[in-house]
Interface confidence: low
C-alpha cells in the first residue's frame, strides 16, 4: 500500500525523485483524465523502483474501481530481458499498453470508451525472478467520462382509476437535464429523479398524469447535446398506443 | 499549529453506540488522509481505520469492521468515527492520526509513509 | 491480514548502549514498513517510514534498515529520552496492523 504527496511538476517524470542516488518505490499518476464516450484516453502511470538495472520477468496490471482488490481490465508479462509485454489480459479487447514497462512506464490506452468505464484504475507492477518485489498505485486515476444525452427509454404506463403516466430515461455525462412538452404541457421539468443508486449516469423524468391525447417530448440536455424522443397517448376503447 | 484533538470518548453500556469527532487544524486538512488508532489499557497499538483525503474509501481493522464507520466533513476539518455495537474489548485510548504526505490536485507521486500528527487522545470504556 | 512480531518483548539496556530491535512482516511487504517510539501517556511519535527514510526531527542515532519481511530498527547510543516502547507498522496493505511492541528500559 501506498502514500502520495503533492508534485507540482507538469511532467510526471521531472520529479528530484528520478535524480536521487537511492531510488524508492514509488508511482505517479494524473488524480483524473477526461475523455468523451466513443472516443479513446489515455491513463498515465509511471513509477520508480528500488531494483536498479532489473531485467527479470516482470507482470503489468491494471485494476478498475478499487486498489488491491477490484478486478482487473488489463495484464501483461515480459520475460526476462524482454521489452515485449505480452498481453495476457485486455477486458472486451478495448485495453492497449502504451508505456514500455522495461523504462518504467505503465501507460494504458482505453478505445471505445462508454459512460461505464467512468471509474477509478490502478495501475501495478510485479517483479519475479531473482527479485521478488511489486507495487500498486494506491489512490489511482480517476477515468471522468463525458457523453451527450441519449435517450434510453420512454413509455407511457397505466396508473390507477384509468389514467395514464409517461416515464423517460435518459443518460449522458453531465447528468442531463430533462424536460418534458406536450399538449397542455408547455415545456415542464415534471417530476425529475436524481440518478439512480448504481446507475450514476441515468435520470429519470416522470409525468404523473397525462390529461390529453396527443404527442409528448422528451428532452434531454447537457453540456455536450440534447437527444429528443416521443410518445404519442391516444386514448381509444380505455387503451393507449405509444410509439418513439 | 498543526494539531488533531479528539473528542465524544465517555463510558458507555456494551450494545451502545459512541461517536469520536476529531478535529485540525493548522493544516489544510483535506488534502491528507486521517487514521483512528486505539490503545487498550497497558497493551499495544492497534490500528482501527483509515479514510482517504477525499473521503473517497475507507479500510478498517477486521475486529471492527461492520461495527465502526469513519467520515469526514471536509468543510468542518472534522473525521467522525461512528462506534456501534460497542463491546468491552473496544476499551481503549482512541487516537486520530495524520498521514505524513498530501495530496495535490496535479499528480499523485505514491509513496508509502507513516502518521506524523497524532491528536492527545480519548478514552471510551465500554462496561456495564 | 499481515501479522508482525517484534523481538524482544522488552530490553532493558544502558545510556550509550548500541540496541537493535527487529520486526518481522508475516510476508513480504517490501519496504512499506514504520517505526513509532512512545512514551507513558503520551501519543506515539513516527521515527522511521518507508523502513530506512529518518523522519524530520529526529535524532540521528536513530536509524531503520530491511527489506521484504525482516526489518530492524537500530539506537547506536542510547540516550535517557530513549526509554520507552517501539512499535514497527506495515502500510503496504490494509489493515495497518502494528507490532506488538518492544519496551526498552533502564538496566
Known amino acids: 500500500f501506498v502514500r502520495t504527496k503533492i508534485d507540482t511538476t507538469e511532467n510526471l517524470l521531472n520529479t528530484e525523485v528520478h535524480s536521487s542516488p537511492a531510488q524508492r518505490w514509488s508511482m505517479q499518476v494524473p488524480p483524473e483524465v477526461s475523455a468523451e464516450a466513443g472516443d479513446a484516453a489515455v491513463l498515465p502511470c509511471t513509477f520508480t523502483h528500488p531494483h536498479r538495472h532489473y531485467d527479470g520477468p516482470l507482470t503489468a496490471i491494471w485494476r478498475a474501481g478499487e486498489p488491491y482488490a477490484g478486478p482487473q481490465v488489463f495484464r501483461c508479462a515480459a520475460a526476462r530481458g524482454s521489452e515485449l509485454c505480452q498481453t495476457a489480459l485486455s477486458l472486451h479487447g478495448r485495453f492497449r499498453l502504451l508505456g514500455n514497462p522495461r523504462r518504467n512506464d505503465l501507460s494504458l490506452r482505453v478505445e471505445r470508451l462508454a459512460l461505464a468505464d467512468d471509474r477509478r484504475y490502478f495501475c501495478r507492477v510485479e517483479f519475479a525472478g531473482d527479485v521478488h518485489d511489486r507495487y500498486e498505485s494506491r489512490h489511482g486515476v480517476r477515468l471522468h467520462v463525458t457523453a451527450a444525452p441519449r435517450i434510453v427509454n420512454i413509455s407511457v404506463l397505466p396508473s390507477p382509476a384509468h389514467a395514464f403516466r409517461a416515464l423517460c430515461t435518459a443518460e449522458g455525462e453531465p447528468p442531463p437535464a430533462l424536460a418534458w412538452s406536450g399538449p397542455a404541457l408547455g415545456n415542464s421539468l415534471a417530476a425529475v429523479r436524481s440518478p439512480r443508486e448504481g446507475h450514476g449516469h441515468l435520470v429519470t423524468a416522470e409525468l404523473p398524469a397525462l390529461t390529453h391525447d396527443g404527442r409528448y417530448t422528451c428532452t434531454a440536455a447537457n453540456s455536450l447535446g440534447r437527444s429528443e424522443a416521443s410518445v404519442y397517448l391516444f386514448r381509444f376503447h380505455g387503451a393507449s398506443g405509444a410509439s418513439t | 499549529q498543526v494539531q488533531l484533538v479528539e473528542s465524544g470518548g465517555g463510558v458507555v453500556q456494551p450494545g451502545r453506540s459512541l461517536r469520536l469527532s476529531c478535529a485540525a487544524s493548522?493544516?489544510?486538512?483535506?488534502?491528507?488522509?486521517i487514521y483512528w488508532v486505539r490503545q487498550a489499557p497497558g497493551k499495544g497499538l492497534e490500528w482501527v481505520a483509515v479514510i482517504w483525503h477525499d473521503g473517497s474509501n475507507k479500510y478498517y481493522a477486521d475486529s471492527v469492521k461492520g461495527r465502526f464507520t469513519i467520515s469526514r466533513d471536509n468543510s468542518k476539518n472534522t473525521v467522525y468515527l461512528q462506534m456501534n455495537s460497542l463491546r468491552a474489548e473496544d476499551t481503549a485510548v482512541y487516537y486520530c492520526?495524520?498521514?505524513?504526505?498530501?495530496?495535490?490536485?496535479?499528480?499523485?507521486?505514491?509513496?508509502?509513509?507513516?502518521?506524523?500528527?497524532w491528536g492527545q487522545g480519548t478514552t471510551v470504556t465500554v462496561s456495564s | 491480514d499481515i501479522q508482525m512480531t517484534q523481538s524482544p518483548s522488552s530490553l532493558s539496556a544502558s545510556v550509550g548502549d548500541r540496541v537493535s530491535i527487529t520486526c518481522r512482516a508475516s510476508q513480504s511487504i517490501s519496504s512499506y514498513l514504520n517505526w513509532y517510539q512512545q512514551k507513558p501517556g503520551k501519543a506515539p511519535k513516527l521515527l522511521i517510514y518507508a523502513a530506512s527514510s529518518l523522519q524530520s526531527g529526529v535524532p540521528s542515532r536513530f536509524s531503520g534498515s530491511g527489506s521484504g519481511a525482516d526489518f530492524t530498527l537500530t539506537i547506536s547510543s542510547l540516550q535517557p529520552e530513549d526509554f520507552a516502547t517501539y512499535y514497527c507498522q506495515q502500510t503496504y496493505s490494509p489493515p495497518f496492523t502494528f507490532g506488538p511492541g518492544t519496551k526498552v528500559d533502564i538496566k
Open positions: 493548522g493544516f489544510i486538512f483535506s488534502s491528507y488522509d
Open positions: 492520526a495524520r498521514d505524513t504526505h498530501s495530496y495535490g490536485s496535479r499528480i499523485y507521486y505514491d509513496y508509502n509513509y507513516g502518521m506524523d500528527v
